[in-house]
């Protein structure tokens, strides 16, 4: 178990011409808020459950009104983090969708307006417990800058938050340097001890006593940047073990390159060689490329070979959006005719037709009277997707099979007596009345 945390740093017009001045019009004040949706990045999640890892909503930002003519200030953003708790293991690779919503305030026809200003999506690798990762994403004319991290909630630990280490009430049962660890109360776990002197910033170990270097670093203790040629560094004291000069403090010490970038010294400063998907002076900017798999639901990614060139998602049928993240509501086009019910099955559309209609789109009006016989001289009348019989006198029912009592409806007025007759009915009128139904 743990928490994914997202911190929005800024949202505003991106660089370049045609960028909007502000998300609010000069006429109406508005405020922004953000919504984040997470899903495991390696599994092909169904479109119906895009937030399988969880979702979160920011507070509303302060009300902002654009002042015509004044320089556009930084937009006021909502306070606080967006936190998405996760119950199970952190997947390591995840997909995100961050939406920026605008709520317009003030009176207008149709009431308050709500608009999705920007939706950015991407796929990232992230170990729980690591430092904040910074990102910049562009959506249309807008630019969103944010940081994110995943952290485990005690007692969970590890890069996936799957190991449970819980302090016991009697820690002395474990020897010095050992920590008590669940699930077994009497099991004591030794913390992984790397080779003595192994750089905590640039080295790591998976077995006790070893020192493996992160990309860009070398040497037995991972303290030498890769670009430093052996024994040629002009700085620092001589090392007793190698006879080489050990680098003294330089611009690459502490590796200023973020996100696994490797640092190399230049005459004036340093230069970062960034891994794919990152750029910037310190590899702090993440540009989404096709390698990041930004297209959801089987979309085909084209272009975007490097972070500076845009990618385009070609969406499969049934999906739309810049990242194919939206399911097309194909039934809204009302493809089923004659009152048929539209069913979007994802892979296909189906029309459930009303009685009397058929065809893929219910376009065929069936002959309701075909094969339908009306008994006792009745005639079939088509209509409304069902057949109906107009029965001869003296018969009734759906198929004119029932003998009808013509006097049941009391057709004779003014107290006249009704008699059923083979040809219909006869009224015997009370004194003073006449007519077929004693109506006069």
């Amino acid at each position: 178990a743990g928490v994914f945390e997202l911190q929005i740093h800024s949202f505003g017009p991106g660089p370049g011409p045609g960028a909007p001045r502000s998300p609010c019009s000069a006429r109406l004040p508005c405020r922004l808020f953000f919504r984040v949706c997470l899903k495991p990045g390696l599994s092909e999640e169904a479109a119906e459950s895009p937030c399988a890892l969880g979702a979160a909503l920011s507070a509303r930002g302060p009300v902002y009104t654009e002042q015509p003519g004044a320089p556009a200030p930084d937009l006021p953003l909502p306070d606080g983090l967006l936190q998405v708790p996760f119950r199970d293991a952190w997947p390591g690779t995840f997909s995100f969708i961050i939406e920026t919503w605008r709520e317009e305030l003030g009176d207008q026809i149709g009431g308050p307006a709500w608009s999705l200003l920007a939706r950015v999506a991407g796929r990232r690798r992230l170990a729980a417990g690591g430092p904040w990762a910074r990102d910049i994403q562009r959506a249309g004319a807008w630019e969103l800058r944010f940081s994110y991290r995943a952290r485990c909630e005690p007692p969970a630990v590890g890069t996936a938050c799957t190991r449970l280490c819980r302090p016991r009430s009697a820690p002395s049962r474990c020897g010095p340097g050992l920590r008590p660890c669940a699930p077994l109360e009497d099991e004591c776990e030794a913390p992984l001890v790397c080779r003595a002197g192994c750089s905590p910033e640039h080295g790591f170990c998976e077995q006790p006593g070893e020192c493996r270097c992160l990309e860009g670093w070398t040497g037995p203790l991972c303290t030498v940047p890769v670009s430093t040629s052996s024994c040629l560094s002009p700085r620092g004291p001589s090392s007793a073990t190698t006879g080489c000069l050990v680098p003294g403090p330089g611009p690459c010490d502490g590796n200023p390159c973020a996100n696994g970038g490797s640092c190399s010294e230049t005459p004036r400063s340093f230069e970062c060689t960034c891994p794919r998907g990152f750029y910037g002076l310190r590899c702090e900017v993440s540009g989404v490329t096709c390698a990041d798999g930004p297209c959801f639901n089987g979309g085909l990614c084209v272009g975007g070979a490097d972070p500076d060139s845009a990618y385009i998602c070609h969406c499969p049928p049934g999906f739309q959006g810049s990242n194919c993240e939206k399911r097309v509501d194909r039934c809204s086009l009302q493809p089923c005719r004659n009152g048929g019910l539209c069913l979007d099955l994802g892979h296909a559309l189906r029309c459930r037709c009303r009685a009397g209609f058929a065809g893929p789109r219910c376009e065929h009006d069936l002959d309701d009277c075909a094969g339908r016989a009306c008994a006792n001289g009745g005639t079939c009348v088509e209509g409304g997707g069902a057949h109906r019989c107009s029965c001869a006198l003296g018969f009734g029912g759906r198929d004119c099979r029932e003998r009808a009592d013509p006097c049941a409806a009391r057709p004779c007025a003014h107290g006249g007596r009704c008699y059923a007759h083979f040809s219909g009915l006869v009224c015997a009128c009370a004194p003073g009345y006449m007519g077929a139904r004693c109506e006069f």
Partner: nanobody
Framework: QVHLMESGGGSVQAGGSLRLSCVAS????????MGWFRQAPGKEREGVAF????????YYGASVKGRFTISQDNAQTTVYLQMSSLKPEDTAMYYC??????????????????WGQGTQVTVSS
């Protein structure tokens, strides 16, 4: 697509109460707003009450404010309209509406892409 099913309509005396329900099914995770419109014979469709699901914000038409209350369940797939102090002029067909659109005006029917069949409410004096 989101499918909507209304219930709870009926006949009631003036001053009485009714509770309408609208259950959404289908792609409900995309619901941004849900609410109720009504239409009396010979009149235009009128916005009654709405809840913007993404924030839980509620809105009411001027003619029902203070008498009607809209709410949603925890799963955000059902909305309820509690109608109190009903008047004869509340008589109409009540339609549940839902929006999965990226832009919508709360009281404008154009912003809603899913509609229920309607449930009749009749208030007699």
């Amino acid at each position: 697509q989101v499918h909507l099913m209304e219930s709870g309509g009926g006949s009631v005396q003036a001053g009485g109460s009714l509770r309408l329900s609208c259950v959404a099914s289908g792609n409900t995770y995309r619901l941004n707003s849900m609410g109720w419109f009504r239409q009396a014979p010979g009149k235009e469709r009128e916005g009654v009450a709405f809840i913007v699901m993404i924030r839980g914000t509620t809105y009411y038409g001027a003619s029902v404010k203070g008498r009607f209350t809209i709410s949603q369940d925890n799963a955000q797939t059902t909305v309820y309209l509690q109608m109190s102090s009903l008047k004869p002029e509340d008589t109409a067909m009540y339609y549940c509406a839902a929006s999965t659109k990226d832009q919508f005006y709360v009281f404008n029917p154009i912003g809603y892409d899913s509609w229920g069949q309607g449930t009749q409410v009749t208030v007699s004096s």
